[in-house]
């Protein structure tokens, strides 16, 4: 990681638990204010590798429900609605940070985890064609 | 949130602090061993709606680095590797947490932070508003 | 229980025409792709066509592609392969196949066959 | 198209023994890979999915495992109802195609 220079505003914390153990306020602060994910909703449903919203909801973790993607088909949508046998579906993964309770069904203590999610679909050629 | 139970073995934390600032371990625990999300890097290139990354730093941030996919085109790519018009390539995006310090500079100080990165791109039938 | 049922092999001569029928039952036809396979004597298994739900896509590989055609009555819940131009390396059993899909990747179900000698 | 190579193209051994039949594919496959089982005179019957996913009904002695060209079938305990045939099939690239076969007998 990148070394901060110590704020002297900044709370205390001895050496040997740093960076180990932090604490994080837990008020999200959204950045989003500008755009609206609501407007890429419709995606799903009109791509040409459309795909399914599925609810994974974890108790233990922070956030406790995330959406993951599943293409509902093998291969593309052409634009009669059938599929392309020459083109596939795949998902579009991505790792992102979550917070797991820590020891179990504590309140307020985390590790920090990270985990794949699959976030759309997208569709690609199977074959890359090798050039000599 | 869901009311969890204390556990006896947990950390304690005045309820006037919670759960507004909560203990995080930052040792990452990836639960990632099983797939390997090297294997999709090349769909960015074989996309019929490609995408190129782009880096966004920022060290008062965890995680600091973060990619963002930018559309190559506005339409898709055709099997002839022409693009077609028709149809547009969208950027697929996800609300992700991120760490904030804060305090700016604070090295075991942050809050919670929703951000909003585009993953990916996926080719779309655009909407057509029908005039009466 | 799902059942699929080839008929219409034989024997036929190179050059010659021959017409598959597979009758499906069981479950509800118009919902799954459908495959045609076939294994000659003694060998593997080798995709010969495929065709989608409602018949809107299909796929042939080179070795068959323009002498055989797969389609579907859905009405009938059957699936063809008209086969023309048969050649001796043709001579195969047939097998058609069931998708868990609407679109014909991997097969669930098959037939029990049926035997296409092309001989003189 | 893609080439699938399986080996060993047969194979004896013996009631409870571990049973491993491998299949490489000419080029990645991102787990779109099936394998079936064929008796003589029967039609194949489809055991695995995706590389790893046990179709309905199918024993848990059967498994499957790998990513990218390399796959691997296990039986993890042979019973003598197991002595068939057995083939792979990609299906990331048409035309979808099938490994040469391994044949299972029993010692």
């Known amino acids: 990681g990148i070394a901060i220079p110590r704020n002297s505003g900044c709370p205390n914390s001895e050496d040997k638990n740093f960076p180990r153990t932090v604490m994080v306020n837990l008020n999200i602060h959204n950045r989003n204010t500008s755009t609206n994910p609501k407007r890429s909703s419709d995606y799903y449903n009109r791509s040409t590798s459309p795909w399914n919203l599925h609810r994974n909801e974890d108790p233990e973790r922070y956030p406790s429900v995330i959406w993951e993607a599943k293409c509902r088909h093998l291969g593309c949508v052409k634009a009669d609605g059938n599929v392309d046998y020459h083109m596939n579906s795949v998902p579009i993964q991505q790792e992102i940070l979550v917070l797991r309770r820590e020891p179990r069904h504590c309140p307020n203590s985390f590790r920090l985890e990270k985990i794949l999610v699959s976030v759309g679909c997208t569709c690609v050629t199977p074959i890359v064609h090798h050039v000599a | 949130g869901i009311a969890i139970p204390r556990n006896s073995g947990c950390p304690n934390s005045e309820d006037k602090n919670f759960p507004r600032t909560v203990m995080v371990n930052l040792n990452i625990h990836n639960r990632n061993t099983s797939t390997n999300p090297k294997r999709s890097s090349d769909y960015y290139n074989r996309s019929t709606s490609p995408w190129n990354l782009h880096r966004n730093e920022d060290p008062e941030r965890y995680p600091s680095v973060i990619w963002e996919a930018k559309c190559r085109h506005l339409g898709c790519v055709k099997a002839d590797g022409n693009v077609d018009y028709h149809m547009n390539s969208v950027p697929i995006q996800q609300e992700i947490l991120v760490l904030r310090r804060e305090p700016r500079h604070c090295p075991n100080s942050f809050r919670l932070e929703k951000i909003l990165v585009s993953v990916g791109c996926t080719c779309v039938t655009p909407i057509v508003h029908h005039v009466a | 229980e799902v059942q699929l049922v080839e008929s219409g092999g034989g024997l036929v001569q190179p050059g010659g025409s021959l017409r598959l029928s597979c009758a499906a039952s069981?479950?509800?036809?118009?919902?799954?792709?459908m495959s045609w396979v076939r294994q000659a004597p003694g060998k593997g298994l080798e995709l010969v066509s495929i065709?989608?739900?409602?018949?809107?896509?299909?796929f042939y590989p080179d070795s068959v592609k323009g002498r055989f055609t797969i389609s579907r009555d859905n009405s009938k819940n059957t699936l063809y392969l008209q086969m023309n131009s048969l050649r001796a390396e043709d001579t195969a059993v047939y097998y058609c196949?069931?998708?868990?899909?609407?679109?014909?990747?991997?097969?669930?179900?098959w037939g029990q066959g049926t035997l296409v000698t092309v001989s003189s | 198209d893609i080439q699938m190579t399986q080996s060993p193209s047969s194979l004896s051994a013996s009631v409870g023994d571990r049973v491993t039949i491998t299949c490489q594919a000419s080029?990645?496959?991102?787990?779109?890979l099936a394998w079936y089982q064929q008796k003589p005179g029967k039609a194949p019957k489809l055991l695995i999915s995706g590389a790893t996913s046990l179709e309905t009904g199918v024993p848990s002695r059967f498994s499957g495992s790998g990513s990218g060209k390399d796959y691997t079938f296990t039986i993890s305990s042979l019973q003598p109802e197991d002595i068939a045939t057995y083939y792979c099939q990609q299906y990331w690239s048409v035309p979808w195609t099938f490994g040469g076969g391994t044949k299972v007998e029993i010692k």
């Open positions: 080029e990645d496959i991102y787990d779109r």
């Open positions: 065709i989608n739900h409602n018949g809107g896509s299909t």
């Open positions: 069981g479950f509800t036809f118009s919902t799954y792709g």
């Open positions: 196949a069931r998708d868990p899909r609407h679109d014909g990747y991997f097969f669930d179900y």
